[in-house]
């Protein structure tokens, strides 16, 4: 019965299209079959939920249809992608993993990934 450790990259740069991807890996202390993954954003000590998905081990993550997140899972590793990011969304994105079933419950929270988003420069008007 050990505490759960979650690892994620320290820094990620979003693409020019406002897409950022990172891996969230957890060291499972139990044999969980149902896992919940939540992405939290921390800004000025305020924490808000960005998206969340519960999945059965061996199955794909399913986020809500209107979620800005997508992801895939492989063993104790989750590949997360956040879309639609703008410069104002730059911040610390924390991966939270919960082993929901079977009991006991375990919580794991990563140190966060600093995602930098740079809005693309508007294309200059063409004379042609």
């Amino acid at each position: 019965c050990k505490a759960m450790h979650v690892a994620q990259p320290a820094v990620v740069l979003a693409s020019s299209r406002g897409i950022a991807s990172f891996v969230c890996e957890y060291a499972s202390p139990g044999k969980a079959t149902e896992v919940r993954v939540t992405v939290l954003r921390q800004a000025d000590s305020q924490v808000t939920e960005v998206c969340a998905a519960t999945y059965m081990m061996g199955n794909e993550l399913t986020f809500l249809d209107d979620s800005i997140c997508t992801g895939t899972s492989s063993g104790n590793q989750v590949n997360l992608t956040i879309q639609g990011l703008r410069a104002m969304d730059t911040g610390l994105y924390i991966c939270k993993v919960e082993l929901m079933y079977p009991p006991p419950y375990y919580l794991g929270i990563g140190n966060g990934t600093q995602i930098y988003v740079i809005d693309p420069e508007p294309c200059p008007d063409s004379d042609f």
Epitope: A3, P29, L40, V47, L107
Partner: antibody, heavy 118, light 107 residues
């Protein structure tokens, strides 16, 4: 204002039943896991039970397993604790508490007293 | 289950003094440790989570440190309203457990 208000406590005989309620307001109740925590007179805090936001996952302390049932009604913003086969050692103030996004119990109600005595 | 030990059970201080409380876990809880304050007749109030992060609205005279099995909670300068019972709690795995509490009273 974020608030939790418990009700339903009272005096009950050993072997009896009681149903506690916890009314939530000021936040999106359906987005948060919730807990019941109790405190016997003059004693420390003891976690009783936890329920996930959608009621899919439920956990109990060994001391109440098989006797207590936690539930919630997200449409009514209310958390419940059905307590059956009550014992003298269940006498305590019962608090409902919200699980914050980072894991700790960040919002607590004022508590409701349950006394089990013949 | 993870057992939390708080020592001592009671500490006596004068206002303005520095108070240091201890919490030890029977096995590693990483940083999934919180500190709560409880005054007589009131519900507990979250002060510290993640071993060292202050909850919203908590004055900076309250601080926490530690990870794994050994944790410390400090009040840098005791105010009259700080005399209360303080509980540590681990929330990294169920069953969620609390320490027995340390009462901070006036000398």
């Amino acid at each position: 204002e974020v608030q939790l208000v418990e009700s339903g406590g009272g005096l009950v005989k050993p072997g009896g039943s009681l149903r506690l309620s916890c009314a939530a307001s000021g936040f999106t109740f359906s987005s948060y896991s919730m807990n019941w925590v109790r405190q016997a007179p003059g004693k420390g805090l003891e976690w009783v039970s936890s329920i996930s936001s959608s009621s899919s996952y439920i956990y109990y302390a060994d001391s109440v397993k098989g006797r207590f049932t936690i539930s919630r009604d997200n449409a009514k913003n209310t958390l419940y604790l059905q307590m059956n086969s009550l014992r003298a050692e269940d006498t305590a103030v019962y608090y409902c508490a919200r699980v914050g996004l980072m894991g700790p119990f960040d919002i607590w109600g004022q508590g409701t007293m349950v006394t089990v005595s013949s | 289950e993870i057992v939390l030990t708080q020592s001592p059970a009671t500490l006596s201080f004068s206002p303005g003094e520095r108070a240091t409380l201890s919490c030890r876990a029977s096995q590693s809880v990483s940083s999934y440790l919180a500190w709560y304050q409880q005054k007589p007749g009131q519900a507990p109030r979250l002060l510290i989570y993640g071993a060292s992060s202050r909850a919203t609205g908590i004055p900076d005279r309250f601080s926490g440190s530690g990870s794994g099995t050994d944790f410390t909670f400090t009040i840098s300068r005791l105010e009259p309203e700080d005399f209360a019972v303080y509980y540590c709690q681990q929330y990294g795995s169920s069953p969620f457990t609390f320490g027995p509490g340390t009462k901070v009273d006036i000398k």
